[in-house]
Interface confidence: medium
């Protein structure tokens, strides 16, 4: 088992971890959570650069998790669709983190409570019934490197004063992707 | 509004190198990405790879790795690519691209290379 | 890398068809995209995420498909629809081009 990951002390005070997260459930085929430069979300059958997850406790059982690097956010749209975002954004871009007895962990969005999953093989406004929770192994990266490049860990604010703060944000500037210009 | 305003057509001799620009204006350039896709007469796409300049990280097709270096220049929002070593293959129009989200959404107007002796 | 097939190669169709093409994956993509290009010209953007249309894309076209099929369906044909469409993935380095569906008016 993941001893360190599953230690209560690694969940408050800031604690930064560096791993990929694994997932073999059976809805899946074998891949790591992979956050890619443009913003897209996928699986990468094996440890790639774009898989090093930096996972910060924001406080007790509530991380962010950052592309190490891409330096973008891992959010969740209300309709449960993964993005990567330039910014941080608490409401779409904290996840709630549910240790399991036999090492894998669980996520789900602390504002919304959907479940953490890879993107399917369906559009997430397509799956026929809702899916259980996907479960991911921590398996350890390297140690942060010091110093941390400015801004990832002290990102530009939400805009509280959003109509629509669950909306797409980062790359795509506060717009959902239209790809109007 | 969004525009990627690419280079003018390219004559060049077997051997020889090119470099082929694309300036970005009406957006963030360091938010996204800029890919390059090549076009033979006739023919479908082929992306070639991209650059994503807020990190000079660059990603590329296999196929293209040696011919193709992609550079970008955030002082002037222009990306580059040069191609190396050219021979008659590589005649083709040439295509950047911004990519958001997995999408290629704006597109430049394209450069026609011709590799000729 | 992910082969994409894109079937037929060539159509026609009159005006107010139905009309589909379909791209076909060598292995499981979690999206299709898809652009629409005229000769001399760039390719657009047409659709994204399997099944949103892009910006100015006319209702009568829609997409479809998960895992290793995809389609893109126009309700009822127009001219200016002539044109030749690709579809495109990124689930897996490198993105990969379908090789195009050339669609023609009757």
């Known amino acids: 088992h993941p001893i360190p990951d599953s230690s209560p002390l690694l969940q408050f005070g800031g604690q930064v971890r560096q791993r990929y997260l694994y997932t073999d459930d059976a809805q899946q085929t074998e891949a790591h959570l992979e956050i890619r430069e443009d913003g897209t979300v996928g699986g990468a059958a094996d440890q790639s650069p774009e898989s090093l997850l930096q996972l910060k406790a924001l406080k007790p059982g509530v991380i962010q998790i950052l592309g190490v690097k891409t330096s973008r956010f891992l959010c969740q749209r209300p309709d449960g669709a993964l993005y990567g975002s330039l910014h941080f954004d608490p409401e779409a871009c904290s996840f709630r983190e549910l240790l399991l007895e036999d090492g894998y962990n669980v996520y789900q969005s602390e504002a919304h409570g959907l479940p953490l999953h890879l993107p399917g093989n369906k559009s997430p406004h397509r799956d026929p019934a809702p899916r259980g929770p996907a479960r991911f192994l921590p398996l350890p990266g390297l140690p942060p490197a010091l110093p941390e490049p400015p801004g990832i860990l002290a990102p530009q604010p939400p805009d509280v004063g959003s109509s629509d703060p669950l909306s797409m944000v980062g790359p795509s500037q506060g717009r959902s992707p239209s790809y109007a210009s | 509004q969004v525009q990627l305003q690419q280079s003018g057509a390219e004559l060049a001799r077997p051997g020889a190198s090119v470099k082929l620009s694309c300036k970005a204006s009406?957006?963030?350039?360091?938010?996204?990405?800029i890919s390059w896709v090549k076009q033979r007469t006739g023919q479908g796409l082929e992306w070639i790879g991209e650059?994503?300049?807020?990190?000079?990280?660059?990603y590329y097709n296999e196929k293209f790795k040696g011919k193709a270096t992609l550079t970008a220049d955030k002082s002037s929002s222009t990306a580059y690519m040069e191609l190396r070593s050219l021979t008659s293959e590589d005649s083709a129009v040439y295509f950047c691209?911004?990519?958001?989200?997995?999408?290629?959404?704006?597109w430049g107007q394209g450069t026609t290379l011709t590799v000729s002796s | 890398q992910i082969v994409l097939t894109q079937s037929p190669a060539l159509m026609s169709a009159s005006p107010g068809e139905r009309v589909t093409m379909t791209c076909s994956a060598g292995?499981?993509?979690?999206?299709m995209y898809w652009y629409q290009q005229k000769p001399r010209s760039s390719p657009k953007p047409w659709i994204y995420?399997?099944?949103n249309l892009a910006s100015g894309v006319p209702a009568r076209f829609s997409g479809s498909g998960s895992g290793t099929s995809y389609s893109l369906t126009i309700s009822s044909m127009e001219a200016e629809d002539a044109a030749t469409y690709y579809c495109?993935?990124?689930?897996?380095?490198?993105?990969?081009f379908g090789g195009g569906t050339k669609l023609e008016i009757k």
């Open positions: 009406g957006y963030t350039f360091t938010n996204y990405g």
């Open positions: 995420l399997t099944s």
């Open positions: 292995s499981s993509v979690s999206y």
């Open positions: 650059i994503y300049p807020r990190s000079d990280n660059t």
């Open positions: 691209t911004r990519s958001d989200y997995g999408f290629f959404d704006y």
């Open positions: 495109q993935q990124w689930s897996s380095n490198p993105r990969t």
